[in-house]
């Protein structure tokens, strides 16, 4: 099933201690899906979308950026025929960096 879209959303982190907010959204015909956020291939967080919504926002506490390394991806799962779980393709990667403040 098609990959979700992924995006870092504001407020954006300015240091590694700041929280990170990452939204993940399934295509239009998959509301209420279960979403998994990965970083460097490891599971970071799981969330379920409301039954009338296509997406979720993962809120990662400060320091989540430190390990493991690599970009974030997300994936969703839905119940298919015969109540079998179907997993989507992985989203595109999204990178998080911490800009040098411009004084």
């Amino acid at each position: 099933i098609p990959a979700p879209s992924i995006r870092l959303v504001p407020p954006y982190p300015s240091s590694q201690e700041d929280p990170i907010h990452i939204a993940c959204m399934a295509p239009g015909n998959f509301p209420g899906a279960n979403f998994t956020l990965y970083r460097g291939g490891q599971v970071v967080q799981l969330l379920q979308a409301p039954t009338d919504q296509r997406g979720v926002t993962f809120n990662l506490s400060g320091g989540s950026s430190k390990a493991p390394g690599g970009p974030f991806h997300c994936q969703y799962g839905v119940l298919g025929e015969l109540n079998q779980s179907q997993l989507s393709d992985l989203s595109e990667p999204v990178n998080v960096s911490f800009p040098v403040p411009t004084w």
Epitope: S5, I6, R7, L8, V9, P10, P11, Y12, S14, H21, A23, C24, M25, P27, G28, N29, P31, Q53, R54, G55, T57, V94, N95, V96, S97, F98, P99, V100, P101, T102
Partner: antibody, heavy 120, light 111 residues
């Protein structure tokens, strides 16, 4: 106060290139995602591209994908749109706009726009 | 990337209310709450009026309100004033990285 000032528009022949700039002031530019939105004469708004606060993630409308490149220089508080292989249908006023500070709070600040005319 | 559907025009008398609709699909307007409304005067840049369906930025009069039902979002302008005469655009995300606009609605305030 927040200011976004576009420049670089003008008359250009089909197939040629143009680079637009958007100079930002009055806010911490490096903390905001930035968009380009265009409006053909007498027509509605059309989203063109977005770039993340740090420049690492960029997305484009299908109509400009492969021809336009959005970029930013946070040290200069400036957003850019490199437009290649221009077509007559790219004729429009091009606006830069900043995302809100909160989640999905819309495009809360806009520049005054710069007119790009593609014609032979 | 087809535009969201808005009526081309709307009108109302001063003091009355008018509602402008914005119809999409379950893939955009109906699938989340990331709907915004913008006001644009001729020759000027758009101005944000409503975000996340019904939230007003500071400085926007409470005469402007937003709502959503199913795949249709609505902007209501109550207590119409002459200075409300402008073009109004809705926007929504088709996916997280693809912003769509409606075709725009020209609002006319009658005598």
């Amino acid at each position: 106060q927040v200011q976004l000032v576009e420049s670089g528009g003008g008359l250009v022949q089909p197939g040629r290139s143009l680079r637009l700039s958007c100079a930002a002031s009055g806010f911490t530019f490096s903390s905001y995602g930035m968009h380009w939105v265009r409006q053909a004469p007498g027509k509605g708004l059309e989203w063109v591209a977005v770039i993340s606060y740090d420049g690492s993630n960029k997305y484009y409308a299908d109509s400009v994908k492969g021809r336009f490149t959005i970029s930013r220089d946070n040290s200069k508080n400036t957003l850019y749109l490199q437009m290649n292989s221009l077509r007559a249908e790219d004729t429009a006023v091009y606006y830069c706009a900043s995302e809100g500070v909160d989640f999905w709070s819309g495009l809360d600040y806009w520049g005054q726009g710069t007119l790009v005319t593609v014609s032979s | 990337q087809s535009a969201l559907t808005q009526p081309r025009s709307a009108s109302g008398s001063a003091g009355q209310s008018v509602t402008i609709s914005c119809t999409g699909t379950s893939s955009d307007v109906g699938g989340h709450n990331y709907v915004s409304w913008y006001q644009q005067f001729p020759g000027k840049a758009p101005k944000l009026l409503i975000y996340e369906v019904s939230h007003r930025p500071s400085g926007v009069p409470d005469r402007f309100s937003g709502s959503k039902s199913g795949n249709t979002a609505s902007l209501t302008v109550s207590g119409l004033q002459a200075e409300d005469e402008a073009d109004y655009y809705c926007s929504s995300y088709a996916d997280l990285n693809n912003l769509m606009f409606g075709g725009g609605t020209k609002l006319t305030v009658l005598g």
